[in-house]
Amino acid sequence: EVEKTACPSGKKAREIDESLIFYKKWELEACVDAALLATQMDRVNAIPFTYEQLDVLKHKLDELYPQGYPESVIQHLGYLFLKMSPEDIRKWNVTSLETLKALLEVNKGHEMSPQVATLIDRFVKGRGQLDKDTLDTLTAFYPGYLCSLSPEELSSVPPSSIWAVRPQDLDTCDPRQLDVLYPKARLAFQNMNGSEYFVKIQSFLGGAPTEDLKALSQQNVSMDLATFMKLRTDAVLPLTVAEVQKLLGPHVEGLKAEERHRPVRDWILRQRQDDLDTLGLGLQGGIPNGYLVLDLSMQEALS
């Protein structure tokens, strides 16, 4: 807490300008009017204040706006934003995407801080849903943003927003998240033709059900092994050898290198060995010839 001291004669600030960097902390406290600071916040970022001086300016704004800063001040905070605590930010009502961008810019190049997480949370809650422009902005600054959301939060993403998602934005998503995103992507890209559709849907396929994978296998998509390895095991298991061969196209040869890893390992265990042999890859571990395969899940469904 800075002591209340009278402003020395002739030092009362008439505007926010560079002369203030020569003020001591107590002079800034005594000589800068908080209302003047609030109306001229856009100038602060161009003036090389020390961190200690910025603390004083924040203190002045906190006194002026105990219930939280108005957006007119927030959008011009610049590096003063780095001085804010999540508690401060929870008092804000940020509705403008431009304000959000300005503050994210300040934190650019750093990990998502608790301040930024709180800011994004306030912004998205205020908007009610994660619209395309917001998602575009957030993933541009934080590619992993989407995968940091819970499946419940992801359910508020409208299908139209999926167009803003880049493959790298999904790198850290787990199957539960892809389960929510895949149907939205399918809806978003439904009017695209085969090859274009596959390019767009590919990064979401970790959430695809068996029937969609079967449908893709009929379209000469040549799925790469990296994508195949990210598919849900339960979605891959029912695929026949012929379907997997069609799905992977020339990439089918890569199965040999992955035969000990899921989902390939589990899929091999479900196939007849003579079907696997038709691939000519030397895949081992299939069901020996002459064995009867009982699909217990089907039996349960019938009883």
């Epitope: 505007e15 002369s19 960097i21 161009a46 090389p48 810019e105």
Partner: antibody, heavy 115, light 109 residues
């Protein structure tokens, strides 16, 4: 809008002094720093020092300490840079620039030091 | 006053993006958020392109952007144009002095 107009080119003898002026118009003169930056032929920019006219406080780069004097006259909105004990390596274009971020620049003054 | 370190030259083709780095120390670039970038065409005075690491003065194209990570600041120019060919200087303000980088010559191929 802000404009900075500098004095004309100078040719000086080694050991002498030169005083370059920079007249500002537009905006508030007193409350914005005026910096002096020089550039030797084919070389980069070199910050020499600055002054905050309202306080008359000047700060100098270590390299020029004791050889340069920066002053400001608020009544005419003019800043001055005087460099003494000139040597041939001081041959350069000398610029004044306003604001700490050097937002506005003068046209430059060529100072040639030659015997 | 130790100069900041910039590459002597960079080049790029029209339409491409290029990035110029500016490396300082934890007591200048690393500690303060006051890095500026200047563009200088031959025979002309420098022009402020970026200040306070990321801010653009009005009138400067949004093809120019700044960023900072640790002790290194960067200037990125996207959609390179012929008129971008110039010398670029970074500068860092540490109260009450300022220090420049050695400059980078950008060539548009």
């Amino acid at each position: 809008q802000v404009q900075l107009v500098q004095s004309g080119a100078e040719v000086k003898k080694p050991g002498s002094s030169v005083k370059v002026s920079c007249k500002a118009s537009g905006g508030t003169f007193s409350s914005h720093a005026i910096s002096w930056v020089r550039q030797a032929p084919g070389q980069g920019l070199e910050w020499m020092g600055n002054i905050m006219p309202i306080f008359g406080v000047a700060n100098y780069a270590q390299k020029f300490q004791g050889r340069v004097t920066i002053t400001a006259d608020e009544s005419t909105s003019t800043a001055y840079m005087e460099l003494s004990s000139l040597r041939s390596e001081d041959t350069a274009v000398y610029y004044c620039a306003r604001e700490m971020r050097l937002a506005y620049w003068g046209q430059g003054t060529l100072v040639t030091v030659s015997s | 006053d130790i100069a900041l370190t910039q590459p002597a030259s960079v080049s790029g083709s029209p339409g491409q993006s290029i990035t110029i780095s500016c490396t300082g120390t934890s007591s200048d670039i690393g500690h303060f958020n006051y890095v500026s970038w200047y563009q200088q065409h031959p025979g002309k005075a420098p022009k402020l392109m970026i200040y306070s690491v990321i801010s653009r003065p009005s009138g400067v194209s949004n093809r120019f952007s700044g960023s900072k990570s640790g002790n290194t600041a960067s200037l990125t120019i996207s959609g390179l144009q012929a008129e971008d060919e110039a010398d670029y200087y970074c500068a860092s303000f540490t109260f009450p002095s300022l220090v420049f980088g050695g400059g980078t010559k950008l060539t548009v191929l």
